[in-house]
């Protein structure tokens, strides 16, 4: 649960019941970036603020989820709340620019994902693997996988174990790992992007 997720939850919890209902209806028709699906109507309409936050983050990841939430709030005329959400999302982000991340356009994007492209460097250079595991837990890692990686004695062996699970991941799952890397070791990601 990162900064963006907390900011989304904050915003949604500050909506009245009527505003939350309106938010959900607008979410059903808001234009989405290519590569993202829509939350099913049936599930969406019955959700409270906490469930909706979780759904937004699982469907759109934290960065785009916050951006989408702000867009809908703006569309509802809640400019100030949208501004506060974006300010909270960007505050203290070490990644450039403001931790913004590309959408998972798996169909449109040829070649290897960043994670696969820089596998060897990530195994050698990631130092805070636990932070990544906590960010991925419950989203792409099961309890057993989480424990298996944590049980490894060194950072490189932890990362090797983590990579043993990635063949089953789709582009969105790999984006979650990239987002976690941007949040924990932005300088490493930037360095690899330049290389």
């Amino acid at each position: 649960m990162g900064r963006a997720r907390d900011a989304i939850l904050d915003a949604l919890e500050n909506l009245t019941a009527e505003e939350l209902k309106k938010f959900k209806l607008k979410l059903l028709s808001v234009p989405l970036r290519e590569g993202y699906g829509r939350i099913p109507r049936g599930a969406l309409l019955s959700m409270d603020a906490l469930d909706l936050t979780d759904k937004l983050v699982s469907f759109y990841l934290e960065t785009y989820g916050a951006e989408l939430t702000a867009n809908v709030l703006r569309d509802m005329g809640l400019q100030e709340m949208a501004g506060q959400l974006q300010a909270a999302t960007h505050q203290g982000s070490g990644a450039a620019p403001a931790g913004i991340q590309a959408p998972p356009q798996s169909a449109a994007k040829p070649g290897l994902h960043f994670i696969d492209q820089h596998r060897a460097a990530l195994i050698a250079r990631v130092t805070n693997v636990e932070w990544l595991l906590d960010a991925l837990y419950g989203k792409v890692l099961t309890d057993e996988q989480y424990q298996a990686v944590r049980a490894e004695p060194t950072n490189p062996s932890k990362m090797r174990k983590l990579f043993s699970f990635t063949p089953a991941w789709n582009w969105t799952c790999k984006d979650l790992l990239l987002q976690a890397l941007r949040e924990s070791q932005s300088y490493l990601v930037e360095d690899l992007e330049r290389s």
């Epitope: 649960m1 805070n128 636990e130 906590d134 837990y137």
Partner: antibody, heavy 118, light 107 residues
């Protein structure tokens, strides 16, 4: 808002067992991990273990592996901890705590006091 | 197990003072350190996660920092509602362990 309501105080004999509960509300019970923490009078906190209510997966502190059993009932959004073969050093306040993931505790219950006395 | 040592054990302050509470880990734990506040007759409350990440709903006067194995919780201009026990918790390696706590009391 998120609430964790724990069951009332327990008085037990040495060698007996107790089962305490932690009823969760205000969030989707199966989404997050539930941890249990022990606090003895005048002493620090000890992490006992956690359960993932979605799968029933449990992970224990080795020091409590033979002492505590964690379970969860999805239908009632309630987590349980059973303590077996009670001894005087099991006298403590036991907290349930909601994990944002298995690493940290976002919300805590009010605690259940267990007193073991002959 | 990783040992977390908190100091001082007790800190007596006047409302309006700014204070720093220390938590030292027995080995490197990265930023896998979380801070909680426990007031009498209340449930503990998460203040800071991962050494310095703020928590929604927690006043901005609470902040955290790290330097190697030394972690600091700072309270900028203490208010009367801040008095209680503060403890740290590590999530670097199992089992999770807690510091012994620092009691913040009114001078």
């Amino acid at each position: 808002q998120v609430q964790l309501q724990q069951s009332g105080a327990e008085l037990a004999r040495p060698g007996a067992s107790v089962k305490m509960s932690c009823k969760a509300s205000g969030y989707t019970f199966t989404t997050y991990t539930m941890h249990w923490v022990k606090q003895r009078p005048g002493q620090g906190l000890e992490w006992i273990g956690y359960i993932n209510p979605s799968s029933g997966y449990t992970y224990y502190n080795q020091n409590f592996k033979d002492k505590a059993t964690l379970t969860a009932d999805k239908s009632s959004s309630t987590a349980y901890m059973q303590l077996s073969n009670l001894a005087s050093d099991d006298s403590a306040v036991y907290y349930c705590a909601l994990g944002g993931n298995p690493a940290w505790f976002a919300y805590w219950g009010q605690g259940t006091l267990v007193t073991v006395s002959a | 197990d990783i040992v977390l040592t908190q100091s001082p054990a007790t800190l007596s302050v006047t409302p309006g003072d700014s204070v720093s509470l220390s938590c030292r880990a027995s080995q490197s734990i990265g930023n896998n350190l979380h801070w909680y506040q426990h007031k009498s007759h209340e449930s503990p409350r998460l203040l800071i996660k991962y050494a310095s990440q703020s928590i929604s709903g927690i006043p901005s006067r609470f902040s955290g920092s790290e330097s190697g194995t030394d972690f600091t919780l700072s309270i900028n201009s203490v208010e009367t509602e801040d008095f209680g026990i503060y403890f740290c918790q590590q999530s670097k390696s199992w089992p999770w362990t807690f510091g012994g706590g620092t009691k913040l009391e009114i001078k």
